[in-house]
């Protein structure tokens, strides 16, 4: 502890100018005081001035007022220092005494004489507050106050406690008139020397090294460091924990970079055409009556569906078509007839069946042939049978698609997995790309097909921390460290929820 | 207890960097009570803090060396270091690192014991 | 920049108190500590936040601080106390170490 016990003389009274022995000063007494202070004894005796003691130059002749001095020989108040826990009680004995000699030092004169004394005893708290009192005799008065306040940096009751304001990185904070630390704007802990981070700042994922920031820790992004940094190249996916890549719906593939619903989200197919999803950007357009391509975006001529009928030629026209009818038949399509079985109508073999009691008829074509009238040979492939560009083929009576590469079917209308063969050596996982299969591969091989055996295994000098396991093939650094619980990271290396400013989590 | 070890190579060329690590054992780097940092002594001199490092990666430099003076930490490794580049014969000294405690006021309690790195050509 | 500045030499008889002083520009007002350093050795904190003593350090080391002057006391100095002595304080965020002082124990 460390404190100081002052003393201000205010007013000495001696009118008579008389010595404790009944003697007069001649010409008049010049007075100077010596105080002790020691410990508090119920019967003031003789012996070391244990709290302290200090002597004053003469200060007035017989009767004076003191003025107040803060520096220099008489100083007033008097300064009595002390270095340890101030106990709350103390004696004082305040001596006036008559000098002959020096001004400034009378303590060192020959011939000093007693004036008068007083004994003070009892209890005293530490405070600004000064107790003020007066003290008579027969000859003499004085008047004086006095309290105990505590050095620079000490508090509390007793001056033990000590306290120094700072702000610098072992602390933020000023002192309270108890020696309790008081925290500057910003700062919190025992030693105020940990920031308050930007309120909402993730406690776990953030951190800050000054006030109100919010720095985040490897695997998390945002201002308050809430939000997960997917794998790299993660093209449509989200994560829930750093470096994951959880697919939007309609994506698939390691980064979500492979659509699987290419028509909802590209719109593909024109002229009202409808659109079916096979594979990874796979997709095949089915075109309304007159239009065709692997769109459907080629308008067909309007004549293109062969609209006339029983030999009828078509015209096209602005927006629609024309039928010019062979003699013998009428219509928009020439399908009325002003012929009969009569007149041998039906072509190619065909035979002629009456109709409407003969005011009609219908051809029965034999195999190959079409039309009202049986003469058209058949096109098998005029309906545009093969899907996914496949070739159509006329085979006498029958017609076959020739399928494009990865597609199958009597229509080509299924689509081949290239991982269908499984091309991926040693247990590699295979993953349909649209330019061809691609393998992940366990560890210790690598290569397009995992075919190729990797004599240094990324993970074979454990590289991953707190028993996590590791895998290669996944990633950019030749593996990925997947964490048990309770630790996060690249390489799982820091543990969750430790102290409020631990650096990491994942 | 806690004890400090710093490794690093005892002669760098002038003009180089010079680069040390503190290797810290029986004890988190992590812990929020700790700075730690490096000071050094030339030959028959006295102590000259260089500078500190929290395990958050805050850093506080000597002004006199700031411009070339950089100290990281890897909590992964419970490890700092110290890099000091352009060296010349007056950096020339051994190299400690300590441990600063909050608790103590920033007194420091734990020390490694030393390296001596010569700057010579 | 902030200085402190120290006695180059103290020499004191075994069991007398040796006192070393180290002054600094408003020192009063920061914490200083004190280091002993025996050659060959690194440096062991003997005081911190002025006249606190870490557990090991003996009693009769010492330490205050007020105005610009902090004092180490050794009282009943013995031999194996002769080593150099060094205060440090933190000026702001940066640290500072005197010259130190050789205490010399005749």
């Known amino acids: 502890g460390s404190g100081i016990f002052q003393l201000r003389l205010q007013e000495f009274v001696n009118q008579r100018g008389m010595l404790a022995n009944g003697q007069s000063c001649e010409p008049g007494c010049r007075t100077f005081f010596r105080i002790c202070l020691k410990h508090f004894q119920a019967t003031f005796s003789e012996g070391p001035c244990t709290f302290g003691n200090v002597s004053t130059p003469v200060l007035g002749t017989n009767s004076f007022v003191v003025r107040d001095k803060n520096s220099g020989s008489g100083r007033n108040p008097l300064q009595l220092p002390f270095n340890f826990t101030w106990p709350g009680t103390f004696s004082l004995n305040i001596q006036a005494w008559h000098t002959p000699g020096d001004d400034l030092r009378p303590e060192t004169s020959p011939g000093n004489s007693l004036i008068s004394q007083i004994i003070i005893q009892g209890s005293l708290a530490v405070g600004k507050i000064w107790r003020t009192d007066e003290q008579n005799d027969t000859l003499t008065r004085l008047s004086y106050s006095y309290r105990v306040i505590c050095s620079d940096n000490y508090y509390g009751e007793s001056c033990s406690r000590l306290c120094k304001k700072r702000d610098d990185h072992f602390g933020h904070y000023e002192c309270q008139p108890d020696g309790s630390l008081s925290c500057l704007p910003g700062w919190t802990g025992k030693y105020c020397d940990q920031p308050i981070c930007l309120s909402g700042c993730h406690e776990q994922n953030g951190y800050c090294s000054k006030p109100d920031e919010c720095i985040c820790r490897p695997g998390w992004q945002g201002r308050l460091c809430n939000e997960c940094i997917p794998h790299n190249g993660c093209r449509h996916g989200t994560c829930s924990i750093p470096w994951q890549c959880a697919c939007d719906e309609g994506w698939g593939g390691l980064f979500c970079d492979q659509d699987l619903n290419y028509c909802t989200h590209h719109s593909p197919c024109k002229n009202g055409s409808t659109c079916s999803n096979s594979g990874p950007k796979g997709y095949t357009c089915t075109c309304l009556p007159g239009y065709t391509g692997e769109h459907c975006e080629l308008g067909l001529s309007k004549c293109a569906s062969n609209p006339c009928r029983n030999g009828g030629s078509c015209k096209d026209q602005e927006n629609s078509y024309h039928c010019l009818c062979p003699p013998g038949y009428y219509g928009q399509h020439c399908e009325h007839s002003t012929l009969t079985c009569a007149d041998s109508p039906c072509f190619n073999g065909g035979s002629c069946r009456e109709r409407n009691q003969g005011s009609s008829y219908a051809c029965e074509c034999p195999p190959n042939f079409t039309g009202s009238n049986c003469e058209k040979k058949v096109d098998r492939c005029t309906s545009n049978p093969c899907a996914n560009g496949g070739q159509c083929q006329n085979r006498g009576p029958s017609r076959t698609c020739r399928c494009r590469p990865g597609f199958t079917g009597t229509h080509c209308e299924l689509h081949i997995s290239d991982c269908a063969r499984s091309p991926c050596a040693h247990g590699g996982t295979c993953h349909d790309l649209e330019n061809g299969p691609v393998c992940t591969c366990p560890a210790g091989f690598s290569g397009r097909r995992c075919e190729v055996r990797i004599t240094h295994d990324a993970c074979a000098s454990g590289p991953c921390f707190n028993g996590a396991t590791c895998y290669t093939g996944l990633s950019p650094n030749n593996f990925v460290c997947n964490c048990p619980y309770g630790f996060v990271g690249s390489r799982c290396e820091f543990p969750v929820g430790l102290p409020p400013s631990f650096p990491w989590v994942a | 207890e806690v004890q400090l070890q710093e490794s690093g190579p005892g002669l760098v060329k002038p003009s180089e960097t010079l680069s040390l690590t503190c290797t810290v054992s029986?004890?988190?780097?992590?812990?929020?009570?700790?700075?730690w940092g490096w000071i050094r002594q030339p030959p028959g001199k006295g102590l000259e803090w260089i500078g500190d490092?929290?395990?958050?990666?805050?850093?506080y430099y000597n002004p006199s060396l700031k411009s070339r003076v950089t100290i990281s930490v890897d909590t992964s490794k419970n490890q700092f270091s110290l890099k000091l580049s352009s060296v010349t014969a007056a950096d020339t000294a051994v190299y400690y690192c300590?441990?600063?405690?909050?608790?103590?006021?920033?007194?420091?309690?734990?020390w490694g014991q030393g390296t001596l790195v010569t700057v010579s050509s | 920049s902030y200085e402190l500045t120290q006695p180059p030499s103290v020499s004191v008889s075994p069991g007398q108190t040796a006192s070393i002083t180290c002054s600094g520009q408003?020192?009063?007002?920061?914490?200083a500590s004190w280091y002993q350093q025996k050659p060959g050795q690194s440096p062991v904190l003997v005081i911190y936040?002025?006249?606190k003593r870490p557990s090991g350090i003996p009693e009769r080391f010492s330490g205050s601080n007020s105005g610009d002057t902090a004092t180490l006391t050794i009282s009943g100095t013995q031999p194996m106390d002769e080593a150099d002595y060094y205060c440090?304080?933190?000026?702001?965020?940066?640290?500072?170490f005197g010259y130190g002082t050789k205490v010399t124990v005749l």
């Open positions: 440090q304080a933190w000026d702001r965020d940066t640290g500072v």
């Open positions: 936040e002025d006249s």
């Open positions: 300590a441990r600063f405690d909050v608790s103590l006021g920033g007194g420091s309690d734990t």
């Open positions: 029986g004890g988190s780097i992590s812990s929020s009570s700790y700075y």
């Open positions: 408003r020192l009063g007002d920061k914490y």
């Open positions: 490092i929290y395990y958050t990666g805050s850093t």
